[in-house]
Structure formats: C-alpha cells, structure tokens
Amino acid sequence: QECTKFKVSSCRECIESGPGCTWCQKLNFTGPGDPDSIRCDTRPQLLMRGCAADDIMDPTSLAETQEDHNGGQKQLSPQKVTLYLRPGQAAAFNVTFRRAKGYPIDLYYLMDLSYSMLDDLRNVKKLGGDLLRALNEITESGRIGFGSFVDKTVLPFVNTHPDKLRNPCPNKEKECQPPFAFRHVLKLTNNSNQFQTEVGKQLISGNLDAPEGGLDAMMQVAACPEEIGWRNVTRLLVFATDDGFHFAGDGKLGAILTPNDGRCHLEDNLYKRSNEFDYPSVGQLAHKLAENNIQPIFAVTSRMVKTYEKLTEIIPKSAVGELSEDSSNVVHLIKNAYNKLSSRVFLDHNALPDTLKVTYDSFCSNGVTHRNQPRGDCDGVQINVPITFQVKVTATECIQEQSFVIRALGFTDIVTVQVLPQCECRCRDQSRDRSLCHGKGFLECGICRCDTGYIGKNCECQTQGRSSQELEGSCRKDNNSIICSGLGDCVCGQCLCHTSDVPGKLIYGQYCECDTINCERYNGQVCGGPGRGLCFCGKCRCHPGFEGSACQCERTTEGCLNPRRVECSGRGRCRCNVCECHSGYQLPLCQECPGCPSPCGKYISCAECLKFEKGPFGKNCSAACPGLQLSNNPVKGRTCKERDSEGCWVAYTLEQQDGMDRYLIYVDESRECVAGPN
C-alpha cells in the first residue's frame, strides 16, 4: 500500500487521499517545522516513526446486510444492504439467487401482420389454449396477451396510394386490414377463450419494404405497462416475424426526424403517433426492456435467426427460437426459450454516478466463476439450487448518502443498497482540556482546532483583527507566489518551514524559498561539502580559506602575484589562484593591454605641468594628475610626442605601474617650438 497525499491538514483529508493512508492522532507527534501532513502516511511508516498502533486512525469500508422476511417468494437475498465506503477501498457483500419453481409468468405475443405472415396468423388463432396449457406446466399463474404490428404508415415503409392504404394486400379479393404501426389487441389474461376470440378477429395487413416496424411495437409494449397489463412477475415478450426490423435513423427515409422518446403513446390501443417519432435504437430498446424486466423471445424464421441472434447479444435476457414457416412450432419454441432464459441469471444495477464503481464475482453452481465483471452472469441455473454473487462497491471520493438497486434481470426481486460515506475519523477525544491549545481551541485527532480569532499549531497566535488573507500576505513573496513557497505553514504571518525528508536538506528563508542542497556541486558534494561551504538560497557561501562558485578552490594568491608581489598587477582580482583581469588586460598577471587606447594624448597636460609647471594644470598639478609620478631618469615604456598648450612638441615616456592609470613619467628637457610666421 502507498499513500500519495497533497496538502493534508486533517484526518478526514488524509482518509480521502487514498486507501493506503492512515492518520496518527498522537499528541506532539509533529516536531518543530513539521507540517501536519506528516501525520498522514501508510501504517508501517507511522509505526516506524513512533506512532502507537492504537493512535492510528484507519477507518475501513464495511457492509451490513438485512433480510426482509415479510412478503412473498424471494429469489434474491439479502433484500437490503448498507455500505460504509471509504474512498478507494471496496466493500464486498454476497447476493444469493435461488431460482423458484412455478414463478408466475405474463406472456405477451407480439406478431408481425405483414402479408407474408398470413399462414402464421391462421395457426396463432388456434393457439390460445395450447399456450396457456404450456404456461401452466411451468407455473400456477400464467397469463397471455396479444398485439400486432406492421410499420409506419408513410412512404417508403408502406404504399401510401389511397387504395393501397385501404387494402395493402397483393390479392385484392383477400380481406386485409389497413397498415398500422402497433395495435394492442388483448390485455394479459388467463382466459384462453378470450385470446382465441380476439386473435380470431385479426386480419392480415401489408407493407412495402422488407424490414418491419417491430422495434416501434416492442418499445410501446415496454413503455405501456398499465395498458398491456403487466404484473410484477416474469414478463415474456414473444416477438414473431419472418423479416428484419427498422431502427433509429431509418425514420429519416420518411422525413421523421424526432428521436424516439421511449414513452407510451397508445390511443384506442393504437400507436397513433408512430409517424412523428423515429424508430428506437437497439440500445434504447434494450434499456427499456431491462428497466421493465421484460425478456424478449424472438420467434423468427430460419433465414432471420442469425440477424436476431446478433440482436440478443445487445439485449440482455433475450432468446431466439427458429419459427417454422407457418408458426406451428411456436409453443415448443416458447417453452425452450423460457427454460433457456430462466436458467440464465444476470445480476445488474441501475445507473450510478461516476463516484461509484460496482463489480461482480459470479460463483455459478456448475463450478464456473467469473471475476470482476460489470454484471453478474450465471448460466444453467437450476430450480432451488442457490448461486452466489460477490458484489464489490468502491467509492472514488467521499460520497453523499444515496441508494441504488441490484436486480436479477427478468425477475422482480431487488436488493436495495444504501451507500454511506466512511470518511470521518472517530478519534479518541483525548481531552476536553483546552490547555493543550493555549485555552483557545480543542483537540481533534491530535491537532488543535482554534477558536475564532486564533491560529497556529497550538492556537498561540491571535489574529488581532487581521484577516487570514492579510496574515497570509506576509507569507507570500508576491501576489503570484504560493504561501511559504508551498514548503511551510504561515503562522501569525510568518513562515514556519517544513522539515524535509531528504538527508542534509533544510528548508529556510523568509518564504521557505531556500534550501541547503540546490547549489553548484564540487567533487559530487554541494558547495564542495560541509567543510568548504554552505548552500544559501542557490549560491555557495564559502568558509574562510575557500572560494569559487562551488567552494572548489583553496584561498591562495601565489599564482596571481607579479614580480613585485602585487596581486594581478592591481588590474584584476585573484579567484581560485588565477587572475580575472579588468577588460583588455591579458593573463596571466594583467600586465599588458594591447587593445587599450594610447595614454599619450590623455597625459600631455600632466607632462607639461609636472616638468615645466605650465599649461592648464599648472596651478593644480598634483590634484589633476594623481596617478603620475615624475622621474628624473629615463624610464622604459611607451614613448610619446604631443603638442603642449603653447604649440611646442613635448617628448615623454610613460612606464605603467601596478594598478589602474598609474604611471612613472620621464619628460625630455627640451621642447621643440616652431616659430610662427612674421
């Protein structure tokens, strides 16, 4: 387990951080500069840091189940489960399904009445008794109902010529009813004679294109439970056809653009608004059937079996049976399909928010196990043989109290699951003694919760009317910075920097913006190691005797001394025993400056005043020429010849001394003065 936390300052925030996080409520667990977040860590880490096991808060997810022994037959148990969910930690509980014998059945026979189903209709008219007898072999309470469909009554689905609308059959002599989308003929009943009578009145109809409007009809059968007469029992919908089906989008062919709304629109037992709404999508229909616990049995002719098998992959709890061309085998087909459907159990739940995740482990009676599936699934379930599903529910965050329902598809039983958050820490109320918080707060899980007007680890700081924003403002470098650089707590308007887990790293500075390791390294050590220097806010500060950007040099100047033992000839600084010369001067000792401008012109007035006490500096020579010293003997250096203030040529030699703008000057005795014209 690991605990990844971000800015945790309470036990609740810690528990919300992840299932591996636990909280130490021990008093004085944190040292100076330690943030409260160090109380939040994995159990082994807290134990290692000296937190006693009974001081560790680690609430766990749990499940409580309740049986409801009232009411009739129950195929699912328990009936109610209460879950306390800690974020990220699953709560698991078992749901048992025991298939009951003789469970009541409602069977609605929905038949395609397009012309090609003429011979099928003849057979179905005689079916009533057989169907009920077959149901009564399975259950003590069976009911049957009947409805029929053709298609939407607009082009290109049917021929809209008035004659063809009156009689759509190819054979004009044949008595044939006008096309319609869906007609609810007989409400669910246990009277087989009524079935025979009402179905006996039905006439065949016809349409134009091959696919039929069967999905429209199925949607109405599912959406109109009162009109159809569905009870809260096993609901079977037999869908008999010899062709395919239109689905969402096909309505556009007839200029029908409004999506199917999944609502009941029966008027006088007819779906009269079928030309206003598009066909439903397969997904929409699947959802509606599941929502209403209706299990479809597709009784289709051989050439359509593959198509409808594809459909059953999308519609849960549905089956396909091959219908003989004249529907003579329909009773046998229904019995087989029912056995197949009722021996397969799907456990599923209603829609949930993103914050809840549910998975199922199915332990089926035949030894087959499916783990971590989005729904439970067992096949070959026998009567009275219990099967178990383990349901695991996980919350991704501290959730609001809520409920959801788990049901076995096609059955009416439900398990109600109430979900509650498990985010509070039931810390020992260590003490009502407020002295631990300077009498200005109370302890909660080892931390002082301060009264209004007080803040600080022990409520030691009075805000004195300053808002927390004002106090926090003193803990920010500027408006765009985070408080204490995110590395400290703002206490009384001052940053208290956190203790670092990194060996040798101290966090410091007015805004905790500095540390002792983020500096240049020498020999693999910060600032050359603790004996050479210290890392201060990103720059090395070297101890006496060391220098350099990483304190890599021992402080000595031997290599920088010129023959007169002047460091860098006074024209540079010695760093790491090497001269750093002022601009233009050359290494190694900053003696020469080949690129510097000639000093001759600069010093003519000085030569004139020093030697002849004449010129502009005559009265102020020593102040105007502080760097120059007159020599009585010739010197080595730069030879100059410049005109003085009287127009005479003066020859002089400048010998550079150590330092900047310092020269020894020797000036020739004689000047060359050219007489002007008379």
Epitope: G33, G488, C495, S500, L506, Y508, L534, F536, C537, R541
Partner: nanobody
C-alpha cells in the same frame, strides 16, 4: 556592526557535557540559518550542526544523538548542548550566522576533551 560572540568552551573529561552559546550583538537581524562548526588542529573547519529559524536542524553523523542545536530567535542566540563528549570532539568551535546579505563568523571558543 553585528558581531557573534561564542562562550561556554573549556576543558572537560570524556563523557562529560558542555553547553556553548553564541550571542549576536549589534543591530537586530533575522538570521535565516545558524550553525556550529569545529576546527581540529591542522584541519579545515567542519560542520557540526545547522538550524533554521523554524527550528529544523541537521547534524554531522559523528555527533548525532549526542549534540543538540537550538536557538532563541527573540534573543538572537544560538546554543549547542554537547553530551557524551569524546576526545575527537576537541577543537575550536565557531558560530556561523546567515542573513540574506551576510555570512557572519564568531571568533571561536576552544573545547578540549581529555581522556
């Protein structure tokens, strides 16, 4: 001008204790980091312990568990409590303090641990 003045050094027997103090005289400065360094004869000065204004501290491995560094920010004073002293703890102990602009050192106080 700010000066650091160490006190509390002296001669002590192995296993004994000493408490060093370092007071900053002069203007009231905020020291971001303060530390103790020692210099054994013929060796460069080396870190003993370092402490931030928040009270977080670092110690040299050789003194962990025996020495405790602390500071009183109100008095601008640094302390080093030295217990279970060993002969190898002998040396001149220097106080060091850092502001944003300055790196200040004391003149040192001698600690001698005899066996």
């Amino acid at each position: 001008e700010v000066q650091l003045v160490e006190s509390g050094g002296g001669l002590v027997q192995a296993g004994g204790s000493l408490r060093l103090s370092c007071a900053a005289s002069g203007s009231r400065l905020r020291f971001e980091l303060m530390g103790w360094y020692r210099q054994a004869p013929g060796k460069p000065r080396d870190l003993v312990a370092l402490i931030t204004s928040s009270g977080s501290a670092n110690y040299a491995d050789s003194v962990k568990g025996r020495f405790t560094i602390s500071r009183d920010n109100a008095k601008n004073t640094l302390y080093l409590q030295m217990n279970s002293l060993k002969p190898e703890d002998t040396g001149v102990y220097y106080c060091n303090a850092h502001t944003y602009t300055d790196n200040l050192w004391g003149q040192g106080t001698q600690v001698t641990v005899s066996s």
